[in-house]
């Protein structure tokens, strides 16, 4: 049987079930009642001279088998209405040990917010049970096989199904995704949708317009032969309840990147600028690398173009290799699979004074007895404009002897090219180095220059110094 | 893509007002973006830039008198004590390139390349 | 701060003509070309024409044209529309500042 909703108000408006008198009162429980049957006293009336029959286990067995009623197999109604139905029973007085009814639904048992009542009517031959079931306002969720089950001396007894199909319009399981294409590329859309009622219909719409003249059968697959540009799309699906649109999606051209919007000049050193970018649009496709431009703002230079490669995150690369005190443009582009991009406005960066890269020249050391002093002296080393300014030196003296070690440093100012420091210990070496400093550092020290230290008389001076280089160009 | 202002009104000096720049099409976390001012028949004045980062850059006769802030979608310039030489009609601009130093504490603008509407703010008594 | 100014205003020139507006400033540009133009029509928001002094913006016809370096710029619009009636803006940014100085305007006036 298949009830269709016009009918629904039927369900319970003819007579009850089996051999129930119409005047007959009932009693009710709601369902979560798990309690045995009234016991045989309520509602029934037996003569005095009448036992009420004992079932032995042996005599169970010869109890006439119970089932439940024959009810409604299938109710079709649309969403939002609401649904009743019903399983019945009659249980003669033979059976003793009954439960109550429970509801299940596609295998699973219903409890809790669920309406259901159960009723009884007990007469002299035994009682007629009836579980009510309702829903209101009948969702997709309510679709399925519901039954009843309930223990009838240690045996369980199931329903038939009656079978709840919930219609209304088409309801999607699978709508189409935004994707990022190539230009002229094929691509595929999804769109599935379902009832009931069957069957549901597809048409796919681009831009507004239909794509397929004939609707097809869902789930449906479009192939878009490829863009030119970026299009919206979403499909309709079409049932006898009527028509359901997916949300639109955006199929994007992928296209090259647009340049980083910002740039930033985090450190620099006398060798090396720390950048940081942030990256444009990536133009719907993932950016794989980003490339640094480096070339000399000096407009005497070349103008040759360094060319820096680095993964596209962390958005962030240190420029080495660079000459101290000059000045950089510098541009970022990055790239994705379509290709580079602009390259960034350039800026300006500068990296700071470097250490002086030579040593001073021509040093000589002398022991000043009289005054017990090492006086020492030394030229000025070409020091080249990105060194820096000198800002003086730094005199290096270490004092060996038996036993004894000791290495002390002394800083002087640019002015001078000499200075003088006192004898730390007699009957020693004193081995001087020298270096320059500048604002960027401190430069390479000279080769040592060794003096021996009498006791308190004779000087064995080792005269030594460093040869000025051929070329001092600055 | 598109910017526009919002809360520009009738104030009276002193109360504090805040306008905010709203933006569709793009990321606030991509782009910089600044405010300019306009007063009645006058030139076009610089008030300030908020980086992709957050970072804030004012003008200098502006520092102090207003402050900028943003979330994700919005960026606000809240004008703390109005005089009536700030009647004017204010505009949000996305700020095409910008080039920080982040150890001198300074950035600089390449070019504003989307406008807004503007939002007119009256200041007076 | 740095200052830009503009001359002369207004410039006036007939339908299918040629005017030219200087930008002069105060001290070098950054990077001695980060010079853009603005154009401005009553009741609008000023719309991007020219960046990097001479670099059209998308959109925007090759009838104007930006030039110069430094401290000196000019846009020169030719073959003159109605439409273009409008105040021109020079704007730019200085090393070792954050101000963004906007020039005082130049106001074509189209006969």
């Known amino acids: 049987e298949k009830w269709e909703e016009t009918e629904l108000d039927q369900l319970f408006s003819g007579p009850l079930p089996g051999r129930l008198p119409v005047n007959h009162r009932p009693f009710s429980a709601p369902h979560s009642s798990r309690d045995q049957l009234p016991p045989p006293q309520t509602g029934r009336s037996h003569p005095a001279h009448t036992a009420a029959p004992q079932v032995t286990s042996t005599a169970s067995k010869l109890l006439p088998p119970v089932a439940f009623n024959h009810t409604i197999g299938h109710i079709v109604l649309s969403e939002h209405k609401n649904v009743k139905f019903n399983c019945s029973i009659n249980i003669p007085n033979t059976y003793q040990e009954t439960a109550g009814i429970s509801w299940w639904k596609d295998g699973k048992e219903l409890l809790g917010a669920h309406h259901s009542i159960t009723q009884f009517y007990p007469d002299e031959e035994g009682v007629s049970i009836i579980a009510l079931f309702s829903i209101a306002s009948v969702q997709r969720s309510d679709n399925g096989s519901y039954f009843c089950k309930m223990k009838v001396n240690n045996r369980e007894i199931v329903s038939d199904p009656i079978y709840v199909e919930v219609q209304g319009l088409p309801y999607f399981i699978k709508q189409p995704e935004s994707v990022n294409v190539t230009r002229n590329t094929a691509f595929n859309l999804t769109c599935q949708a379902v009832g009931p009622p069957e069957p549901v219909n597809i048409f796919w719409v681009q831009n507004s317009s239909r794509v397929n003249e004939k609707p097809e059968r869902s789930p449906s697959v479009l192939t878009v032969p490829g863009l030119t540009e970026t299009a919206v799309f979403s499909c309709e699906a079409h049932n006898d309840k009527g028509l359901t649109v997916s949300k639109g999606v955006h199929i994007n051209i992928k296209v090259i990147p647009s340049p980083p919007t910002e740039v930033h000049i985090l450190n620099s050193t006398a060798h090396s600028i720390l950048v940081s970018w942030v990256p444009g649009f990536d133009g719907y496709s993932p950016l794989q690398n980003c490339s640094i431009q480096v070339k000399e703002a000096d407009r005497l230079s070349n103008g040759s173009v360094m060319v820096f490669n680095t993964s596209a995150s962390p958005h962030l690369y240190e420029i080495q290799q660079l000459q101290a005190l000059a000045n950089y443009s510098i541009a970022v582009s990055c790239r994705n699979e379509i290709g580079w991009s602009a390259v960034s406005p350039w800026i300006l960066a500068s990296t700071t004074e470097g250490a002086p890269s030579v040593a001073p020249l021509n040093i000589t050391v002398f022991l000043n007895e009289s005054n017990n002093i090492l006086d020492i002296r030394w030229t000025k080393p070409p020091i080249k404009r990105q060194d820096g300014e000198l800002v003086g030196y730094r005199i290096s003296h270490v004092w060996e002897s038996a036993g004894t070690y000791k290495e002390l440093s002394e800083e002087v100012s640019q002015n001078g090219s000499w200075a003088q420091i006192p004898v730390q210990i007699h009957n020693a070496t004193c081995t001087v180095r020298i270096a320059a400093i500048t604002k960027g550092g401190i430069g390479p020290f000279s080769e040592p220059v060794n003096i021996i230290i009498p006791e308190h008389s004779k000087v064995d001076y080792a005269p030594s110094s460093t040869p000025a280089p051929g070329n001092t160009d600055s | 893509q598109s910017v526009e202002e919002s809360g520009g009104r009738l104030v009276t000096p002193g109360t504090p007002l805040t306008l905010t720049c709203t933006v569709s099409g793009f990321s606030l976390s991509s782009n910089a973006m600044s405010w300019v001012r306009q007063a009645p028949g006058k030139g076009l004045e610089w008030i300030g830039i908020?980086?992709?980062?957050?970072s804030t850059y004012s003008a200098s006769w502006a520092k102090g008198r207003f402050t900028i802030s943003k979330t994700s979608t919005t960026m606000d310039l809240k004008i703390t004590s109005p005089t009536t030489e700030d009647t004017a009609t204010y505009f949000c601009a996305r700020v095409g390139f910008f080039v920080g130093y982040g150890a001198y504490d300074y950035g600089i603008i390449h070019r504003l390349d989307l406008w807004g509407q503007g939002t007119l703010v009256t200041v007076s008594s | 701060a740095a200052v830009l100014t503009q001359t002369p205003s207004p410039v006036s020139a007939a339908v299918g003509g040629t005017v030219s507006i200087s930008c002069q400033s105060s001290k070098s540009i950054y990077n001695n070309n980060w010079l853009s133009w603005y154009q401005q029509k009553p009741g609008q928001p000023p719309k991007l024409l020219i960046y990097?002094?001479?670099d059209l913006a998308s959109g925007v016809p090759s009838r104007f044209e930006g030039s110069g370096s430094g401290t000196e710029f000019t846009l020169t619009i030719s073959d003159l529309e109605c439409d273009d009636a409008a105040t021109y803006y020079c704007a730019g940014g200085y090393s070792g500042d954050s101000d963004y100085a906007f020039g005082g305007g130049t106001e074509v006036v189209v006969k």
């Open positions: 908020i980086s992709s980062s957050g």
């Open positions: 990097d002094a001479s």
